[in-house]
Interface confidence: low
Amino acid sequence: LSTCKTIDMELVKRKRIEAIRGQILSKLRLASPPSQGEVPPGPLPEAVLALYNSTRDRVAGESAEPEPEPEADYYAKEVTRVLMVETHNEIYDKFKQSTHSIYMFFNTSELREAVPEPVLLSRAELRLLRLKLKVEQHVELYQKYSNNSWRYLSNRLLAPSDSPEWLSFDVTGVVRQWLSRGSELLGVFKLSVHCPCEMGPGHADEMRISIEGFTTGRRGDLATIHGMNRPFLLLMATPLERAQHLQSSRHRR
Amino acid sequence: LSTCKTIDMELVKRKRIEAIRGQILSKLRLASPPSQGEVPPGPLPEAVLALYNSTRDRVAGESAEPEPEPEADYYAKEVTRVLMVETHNEIYDKFKQSTHSIYMFFNTSELREAVPEPVLLSRAELRLLRLKLKVEQHVELYQKYSNNSWRYLSNRLLAPSDSPEWLSFDVTGVVRQWLSRGSELLGVFKLSVHCPCEMGPGHADEMRISIEGFTTGRRGDLATIHGMNRPFLLLMATPLERAQHLQSSRHRR
Amino acid sequence: ALDTNYCFSSTEKNCCVRQLYIDFRKDLGWKWIHEPKGYHANFCLGPCPYIWSLDTQYSKVLALYNQHNPGASAAPCCVPQALEPLPIVYYVGRKPKVEQLSNMIVRSCKCS
Amino acid sequence: ALDTNYCFSSTEKNCCVRQLYIDFRKDLGWKWIHEPKGYHANFCLGPCPYIWSLDTQYSKVLALYNQHNPGASAAPCCVPQALEPLPIVYYVGRKPKVEQLSNMIVRSCKCS
């Protein structure tokens, strides 16, 4: 390897080795290697080897740092948002509103307009504006999957709060799925109160948080203003023309 | 600032500025700044500003990289493990075993022996060896909190698998809590099947995964070997003497 | 990514992770670490060319930012990106200890 | 941490994050970015002294590893640690676009 001067590979390695010498002692806060005078003869105890293996397995399983950024992630992402279908739309009649769940419908054609191909989507967030909350509440997010089944996505423990606050859920995988399925016109999320197995439907806690966009009784301008704050999907995607550029530069390599 | 040559702060700043020029254009895949000839007069459209603000809010809320490593994390961590109290112990009689939950007791005096002070603990993982699983199962982990209440900790969607596999849950906060409370002799975890609100206790899915250490009918040597693979807490902590060293060097500063 | 898969199988002159196995006994003259006997420490090496953004050569420049200067640094430098910890076994007196040392193994590098 | 809190309020000669506000119009001569008008890009600068771990001076050396050479690099370098993205608004023809640029703001640096 050469820059201005020729790099002496062996010298670099030796410096690295010397640095590691200091590093290990330093990490263990030892001024010198510990004496071996009292070490018992024979192999290491089984329990110690087992513990070492457990630790090593953990190392193998998880990297300390995030994955290196894929090439496409270097480039800027276009940001768009798709608002939830308004609650006065008749499609909401399909699901009987309950005290422990709220439903959110999204028009997949609007999503496709924003992100023409699933592969272009780099991140999708479901954003909800929660209003004041007097007590802690544990909520779960689901995606409508097939006829009447729901797929669990994630959960959130919401602390009491005097002021409105935006909640954000990563729903990239779900939106990518919706974009791939041309047939589905609507995508549906459900936000439910968390129910431990010991409780039945009758005993389930009520949904104590108010989500902006589901607040009833507003009329005219005020309804419009608040309607803009209804749940929405925040989308980050590679614009089509940039993706094509990426593709062609990849072919050129 | 000086290294071998005096570093010209202004030059570095200018180079950075020039680099940013290229970086932004490059990220947008533009060869030159876009023409402004067609930009309509007046302020930005409200919807665009709203979208910009949504994106900016996200930026403010979350850093792209993990927090810088605190000083103590630089130093080595001692690794120990504390095995779950064996299931034939009478303390398990306190909780009626159900088809949708399993309970795991840990002796807090053993934890204190391994980690004398809560502040020394840097990570605690609950490790479970799950055996073969034929269908997908969604499980939740709870911590026993007060008399008969359980605090939700986390959840995991387990994919079908033909081979045994170690599951790991980060329970650092819980173990730190147990270490601070001298009065509690036992710490308890509960692993339950996830129950949507629509299902009552009678309809809850059964626990379909087998966890090593709860398998009945083993005797003698085989039971002992399998007992070693029962759930355990893997602890990583700063040894007391190293912590004191850290403390004193902090005071010396 | 400038990781072990790419760098160990290429003759990349620019920034890359370079192979380095540390044998505790042979390289450091240590017998006190019982497990492991050594480890693949690796290290980062190689120039990260500073990319000039002169109007006359913008087209060439823009394509190179991603690899050589993604952070738009004034003086990009080849440094570790992904690091992994290393658990070791050693004795203190008669007592064996297992300890984990953070950020010991370089898995990939980057120009930063 | 070599972050903005520490570095901007100190006269640290070694590796630190340095203050740099980029005004798109004034610094880059650009009028095409409508929002924001500029941003705190910052940058990393300062030496990361290579620490020789000679037996003769271990006591001095060991305390310095953490700050100056935590990765035990043969040639430690001052580089960004925490980075944040930047959203911008600009036009393409008559159409306004909001885009987010990753890793644009340096929040802290490290010797790596």
Epitope: - | E10, R14, E18 | W52 | Q19, L20, K26
Partner: antibody
Framework: EVKLVESGGGLVQPGGSLSLSCAAS????????MSWVRQPPGKALEWLGF??????????EYSASVKGRFTISRDNSQSILYLQMNVLRAEDSATYYC???????????WGQGTTLTVSS | DIQMTQTTSSLSASLGDRLTISCRAS??????LNWYQQKPDGTVKLLIY???RLHSGVPSRFSGSGSGTDYSLTISNLEQADIATYFC?????????FGGGTKLEIK
């Protein structure tokens, strides 16, 4: 329109002191580094120093020839740049220009200049 | 300090001519080379910065080129208004330094 107007030049005896001013308008003064440059009669331009902008804490940098004798300061509320000159010598006789300095290493706008003569 | 040398101290040319003024740095200045025009009344204006980038309002008949240590300013189609002294300046390393100037006269 960017405008820089210097004032305060005149005749001073060797060893004396003088303060030059530069009134700035047409731009946000605090956003810019401001610089002083001089030109002795029939000679080249010489950079004397600059004072940094608000994000950079209004710190100063000087050339070796004037360091310790000349001081650059600014009144941001009035958008005025100053050059305080002490222990003046004959070789300090020149036309003094104030200039706006940018991060690109160049001076993009200059004043018309004010003349200093140091003579007994 | 970096020395900037303009070897030609004065230059005569005719209106409409194309002429080049050169400037040499005592070390590589990485394209941080700027050109200024000083009119006979003492007024100074920036013409070109960063070797080749034209400052706003400067006619396109002015152009700059060069790299490393050697740089030049070219004026094509010389006009009466261009009669002035031209200075180069390096912006690579403090202290900023100027060339001695090249005085342009009409034949």
């Amino acid at each position: 329109e960017v405008k820089l107007v210097e004032s305060g030049g005149g005749l001073v005896q060797p060893g004396g002191s003088l303060s030059l001013s530069c009134a700035a308008s047409g731009f946000t003064f605090t956003d810019y580094y401001m610089s002083w440059v001089r030109q002795p009669p029939g000679k080249a331009l010489e950079w004397l120093g600059f004072i940094r902008n608000k994000p950079n804490g209004y710190t100063t940098e000087y050339s070796a020839s004037v360091k310790g004798r000349f001081t650059i300061s600014r009144d941001n509320s009035q958008s005025i740049l100053y050059l305080q000159m002490n222990v003046l010598r004959a070789e300090d006789s020149a036309t003094y220009y104030c200039a706006r300095y940018t991060g690109g290493g160049y001076f993009d706008y200059w004043g018309q200049g004010t003349t200093l003569t140091v003579s007994s | 300090d970096i020395q900037m040398t303009q070897t030609t101290s004065s230059l005569s040319a005719s209106l409409g001519d194309r002429l080049t003024i050169s400037c040499r740095a005592s070390q590589d200045i990485s394209n941080y080379l700027n050109w200024y025009q000083q009119k006979p009344d003492g007024t100074v204006k920036l013409l070109i910065y960063y070797t080749s980038r034209l400052h706003s309002g400067v006619p396109s008949r002015f152009s700059g080129s060069g790299s490393g240590t050697d740089y030049s300013l070219t004026i094509s189609n010389l006009e009466q208004a261009d009669i002035a002294t031209y200075f180069c300046q390096q912006g690579d390393t403090l202290p900023w330094t100027f060339g001695g100037g090249t005085k342009l006269e009409i034949k």
